[in-house]
Interface confidence: low
């Protein structure tokens, strides 16, 4: 069976002038997935991103995330790329108020 992921992009305050953007994929099966941040369509190097483990979510499916830190005001240049079981999609950073959340960094 194949269950496609739900992808959600969020943003949180990181430090003065910077935000952390996090791309979360959940509810997918099988567990093999590619998540990566892109700037102006070009993949960021892996050392500028942080990945969460692929973990079971208790429903027979899996979840994971990837995060990166970017300059506030440049959100429109960044997208999250997802590839799973032959399907792929890109997800922009949402506009709007920055949420103050616990950072992964």
């Amino acid at each position: 069976r194949t269950v496609p992921p739900m992808v959600n992009v969020t943003r949180s305050e990181a430090s003065e002038g910077n935000i952390t953007v996090t791309c979360r994929a959940s509810g997918f099966y099988p567990w093999n997935i590619t998540l990566s941040w892109r700037q102006d369509g070009v993949s960021l190097s892996h050392d500028t991103q942080q990945w969460g483990d692929v973990l079971p979510d208790g429903n027979g499916t899996y979840q994971t995330w990837v995060a990166t830190r970017i300059c506030q005001g440049e959100e429109q240049r960044f997208t999250c790329y997802m590839e799973h079981s032959g399907n792929h999609s890109t997800h922009p950073v949402p506009s709007g108020k920055v949420l103050v959340l616990q950072s992964h960094w």
């Epitope: 099988p30 567990w31 093999n32 997935i33 590619t34 892109r38 369509g41 070009v42 993949s43 190097s45 892996h46 050392d47 990945w51 790329y81 590839e83 799973h84 079981s85 032959g86 399907n87 792929h88 890109t90």
Partner: antibody, heavy 119, light 108 residues
């Protein structure tokens, strides 16, 4: 049956452009990405770059000023162009498929084609 | 760049013996992005193990992988004649995405 086949000139003159094509079958380049890797005679493997399923590219910084990887999904082909070649670019060039979820690993490879740079 | 150093350079063993191949990274590599390939003379490499320890379908279970951080290991529990080849580790953790120099596994 998944197959990849490299093609192109076996001899390229110094300062010219090396052009290779990888023709794939058994899968679609709209759902799988592709890599180019090379191996100088008697030496190890060197990653050149890759093309993602939506056409974006990632390159090894060592080649970035002279490499272009492109895709023609209608022909199920992706291509490598390496400009301003020297004798140091003599190698067996491989194309490979980026496996789904294999964290950029290359799950199928072409048999390789030897390109010699010589005048 | 991350340099992958494989050891030993050449390993001479007999069929039936256990082979342990090492791959040491110059800086930490995520286990998700460390892969192993096998290459026989005149052939293209083939993927054996991805993400440190995941065996590719069709690869015999005498092959296994382990490790984390900077130290990774490929183990062949009981060597068969067809296992004698060159083995490469490969990291896709940081660009450029490098290979080790290879370990040649030869018949003693």
């Amino acid at each position: 049956q998944v197959q990849l086949q490299e093609s192109g000139p076996g001899l390229v003159k110094p300062s010219e452009t090396l052009s290779l094509t990888c023709t794939v079958s058994g899968f679609s380049l709209t759902t799988y990405g592709g890599h180019w890797i090379r191996q100088p005679p008697g030496k190890g493997l060197e990653w050149i770059g890759m093309i993602w399923t939506d056409g974006w590219t990632d390159y090894n910084a060592a080649f970035i000023s002279r490499v272009t990887i492109s895709v023609d999904t209608s022909k199920n082909q992706f291509s490598l162009k390496l400009s301003s070649v020297t004798a140091a670019d003599t190698a067996v060039y491989y194309c490979a498929r980026k496996g789904h979820g294999y964290y950029y690993a290359m799950d199928y490879w072409g048999q390789g084609t030897l390109v010699t740079v010589s005048s | 760049e991350i340099v992958l150093t494989q050891s030993p350079g050449t390993l001479s063993l007999s069929p039936g013996e256990r082979a342990t191949l090492s791959c040491t990274a110059s800086s930490s590599v995520s286990s998700s992005y460390l892969h192993w390939y096998q290459q026989k003379p005149g052939q293209a490499p083939r993927l054996l193990i991805y993400s440190t320890s995941n065996l590719i379908s069709g690869i015999p279970d005498r092959f296994s992988g382990s490790g984390s951080g900077t130290d990774f290991t490929l183990t062949i529990s009981r060597l068969e004649p067809e296992d004698f080849a060159v083995y490469y580790c490969h990291q896709y953790h940081r660009s450029p995405f490098t290979f080790g120099q290879g370990t040649k596994l030869e018949i003693k």
